[in-house]
């Protein structure tokens, strides 16, 4: 008897069993399970992933696929040999010994086996193509990874080197900062000590200065007395010599030329050999009346008689006609020399006027007039100026032709207003004109847009109040 059975064993493998009499034939087919299910990225018909997988994992899986492929190939070869060697004999025996229906069964088994083999071959071809494709991709990725790795390694090396450099630099700078902090602390301590010492010194110097000022006043008075006494003595000597000498004398007495003891301006003082800037006594022309002035022996060759100075607002310049006529303030600081003296002095010789200006931003400028004089009081000390040069504007900021001098109590300007009252200070106001160096003193940051400040229009504009000004005169032929 014979029969045919198709079944699955305990391991899940498919098997074909043919019973023919006492003989039983069992065919075990190769496992298709080794080709993973579609959920796997490596399923034979699955779409390949583009993203590169972990390199070691890829190599492992590739080896597994290669092993499966080799096993399948070997099994197929064995199956072929087996069919060729054994089945021929068996088939002959079966054909001879079994009934017609058994033949049909065998044909079915054969067909099934052939179909399975063909399918298996197709699958293997697919797997082979996939493996080749995957291998090529993996090789490319491997190459790219290798290049990237090299680049990254180089960058890491560079960065490590930079980090080391920066760490070194940082350590160096930290050390420097610590050193500087130490030095700074020392310096601060030293400066505090110096400050304390200076304060003590300043206190001492202040008292010394006070003493010196007192002595200076005394010395000045003494000096004036001495000068007068010397002058009187010389006159007495001269008159005695005149009396002693007679027309019939056989010998004449040599009279020593009197040394100059009075000076009309600082130029004469400079020429006498006194070349240090400071306060000197000047004598009115054709008079014994004296006045104290500051002589600038440094600027532009020296010999300058300072007629006006502003520097700190310590002196009020909103004064009367009389005060401007006679002068006010301190020649050591802010002052006005006096219109009467300047008028007399400039009326006798040709003088130049230099005006020095300072703004609050540290800039300096000057205006130089090559001829300057003041008319007498009867003409309200009218100013006359010609020949402007300098850096404080190409146009004169003292109105041309000259204006009369005006003060708060003597309005001689050309305005329907009272310029001196409005703009503050005595000046050669026009109506009211482009300048007023005797205006209200304004400190820094309060010095702009000031109607009544210290103004020099053609240098700083109409509302700017200057920091410091000096007006000085010197003979044109100095």
């Amino acid at each position: 008897y014979s029969n045919f059975r198709k079944s699955v064993d305990s391991t899940g493998r498919r098997q074909y069993q043919v019973q023919n009499g006492p003989c039983s034939y069992t065919f075990l087919l190769p496992e298709t399970d080794s080709c993973r299910s579609s959920s796997s990225p490596y399923m034979s018909n699955a779409v390949q992933r583009d993203a590169p997988l972990d390199y070691d994992d890829s190599v492992q899986r590739l080896q597994v696929l290669e092993n499966i492929l080799e096993n399948n190939t070997q099994w197929l070869m064995k199956l072929e040999n087996y069919i060729q060697d054994n089945m021929k004999k068996e088939m002959v025996e079966i054909q001879q010994n079994v009934v017609q229906n058994q033949t049909a069964v065998m044909i079915e088994i054969g067909t099934s086996l052939l179909n399975q083999t063909a399918a298996q071959t197709r699958k293997l071809t697919d797997v082979e193509a996939q493996v080749l494709n995957q291998t090529t991709r993996l090789e490319l990725q491997l190459l790219q990874h290798s290049i990237s790795t090299n680049k990254l390694e180089k960058q890491i090396l560079d960065q490590t080197s930079e980090i080391n450099k920066l760490q070194n630099k940082n350590s160096f700078l930290e050390q420097k900062v610590l050193d500087m902090e130490g030095k700074h602390s020392e310096q601060l301590q030293s400066m505090k000590e110096q400050k304390d010492e200076l304060q003590v010194l300043v206190s001492k110097q202040s008292s010394v200065i006070d003493e010196l000022e007192k002595k200076l006043v005394t010395a000045t008075v003494n000096n004036s007395l001495l000068q007068k006494q010397q002058h009187d003595l010389m006159e007495t000597v001269n008159s005695l010599l005149t009396m002693m000498s007679s027309p019939n004398s056989k010998s004449s007495v040599a009279i020593r030329k009197e040394e100059q003891t009075t000076f009309r301006d600082c130029a004469e003082i400079f020429k006498s050999g006194l070349t240090t800037s400071g306060i000197y006594t000047l004598t009115f022309p054709n008079s014994t009346e004296e006045i104290k002035a500051y002589c600038d022996m440094d600027v532009g060759g020296g010999g300058w008689t300072v007629i006006q100075h502003r520097e700190d607002g310590s002196v009020d310049f909103q004064r009367t006609w009389k005060e401007y006529k006679e002068g006010f303030g301190s020649p050591l600081g802010e002052y006005w020399l006096g219109n009467e003296f300047v008028s007399q002095l400039t009326g006798q010789h040709r003088y130049v006027l230099k005006i020095q200006l300072k703004d609050w931003e540290g800039n300096e400028a000057h205006s130089l007039y090559d001829h300057f004089y003041l008319a007498g009081e009867e003409s309200n000390y009218r100013i006359h100026l010609t020949g402007l040069t300098g850096t404080a504007g190409k146009i004169s900021s003292i109105s041309q032709p000259g204006s009369d001098f005006s003060t708060k109590d003597s309005d001689n300007d050309k305005c329907i207003c009272k310029c001196s009252q409005m703009l503050s200070g005595g000046w050669w106001f026009d109506a009211c004109g482009p300048s007023n160096l005797n205006g209200q003193y304004y400190p820094q940051k309060q010095n702009t847009n000031k109607f009544n400040g210290i103004k020099w229009y053609y240098w700083k504009g109409s509302g700017y109040s200057l920091k410091a000004t000096t007006m000085m005169i010197r003979p044109a032929d100095f």
Epitope: C415, C417, M422, D430, G433, G461, S462
Partner: antibody, heavy 121, light 111 residues
Framework: EVQLLESGGGLVQPGGSLRLSCAAS????????MSWVRQAPGKGLEWVSL????????YYADSVKGRFTISRDNSKNTLYLQMNSLRAEDTAVYYC??????????????WGQGTLVTVSS | QSVLTQPPSASGTPGQRVTISCSGS????????VNWYQQLPGTAPKLLIY???HRPSGVPDRFSGSKSGTSASLAISGLRSEDEADYYC???????????FGGGTKLTVLG
């Protein structure tokens, strides 16, 4: 005697232009800030523009900025106002005014008689 | 709307004293001089008071000006019929970089 004489006013269409002049005499023109002030019919005074003696500083009212230009010719003692892109609201009597104090913006002590500018289509 | 504020009108009888106020801010009245102008009907304005309180020559002493903080005022004493006019206050404004006027006050002399 201080005199200020304006000229150049008249009727102009919106978007048009006019140039006003002010001839000055009787004072040192080159020492004073000069201004233009206008007065719309039945309204108050409105300052228009100011120019400093050396033309270094020029100021305009917001209402005319970018349309009007003030200038002066000290050699001719003349002040000018060039008015462009004129609007109906620019209709007014335009006065030329001299500053009270030379080299300072102190208000106006002398005024011209005015020139009428009418902007209408 | 004017930068300086004035009452639109004021009135008084002959001989009376009238005061016109002018209110501003720190950038105009508060930091600059105030001027007052008189404009008689059909004429150009005329300077009446300059620099807060000064009178130009030719202006009667019946007119006086004063200033306190950001406000100014014009006082007219012994009012006369010829004082009937428009009065304007004016000052430079630092913020606007321009001259500003009040809206004007029309003074009427009654009777």
């Amino acid at each position: 005697e201080v005199q200020l004489l304006e000229s150049g006013g008249g009727l102009v269409q919106p978007g048009g232009s006019l140039r006003l002049s002010c001839a000055a005499s009787g004072f040192t023109f080159s020492s004073y800030d000069m201004s233009w002030v206008r007065q719309a019919p039945g309204k108050g005074l409105e300052w228009v523009s100011l120019i400093s003696p050396d033309s270094s500083s020029i100021y305009y009212a917001d209402s005319v900025k970018g349309r009007f230009t003030i200038s002066r010719d000290n050699s001719k003692n003349t002040l000018y106002l060039q008015m462009n892109s004129l609007r109906a609201e620019d209709t007014a009597v335009y006065y030329c005014a001299k500053d009270l104090i030379s080299f300072w913006r102190g208000g106006f002590d002398y005024w011209g008689q005015g020139t009428l500018v009418t902007v209408s289509s | 709307q004017s930068v300086l504020t004035q009452p639109p009108s004021a009135s008084g009888t002959p001989g009376q004293r009238v005061t016109i106020s002018c209110s501003g801010s720190s950038s105009n009245i508060g930091s600059n001089y105030v001027n007052w102008y008189q404009q008689l009907p059909g004429t150009a304005p005329k300077l009446l008071i300059y620099s807060d309180s000064h009178r130009p020559s030719g202006v009667p002493d019946r007119f006086s000006g004063s200033k306190s903080g950001t406000s100014a005022s014009l006082a007219i004493s012994g009012l006369r019929s010829e004082d009937e006019a428009d009065y304007y206050c004016g000052a430079w404004d630092d913020s606007l970089s321009g001259y500003v006027f009040g809206g004007g006050t029309k003074l009427t002399v009654l009777g």
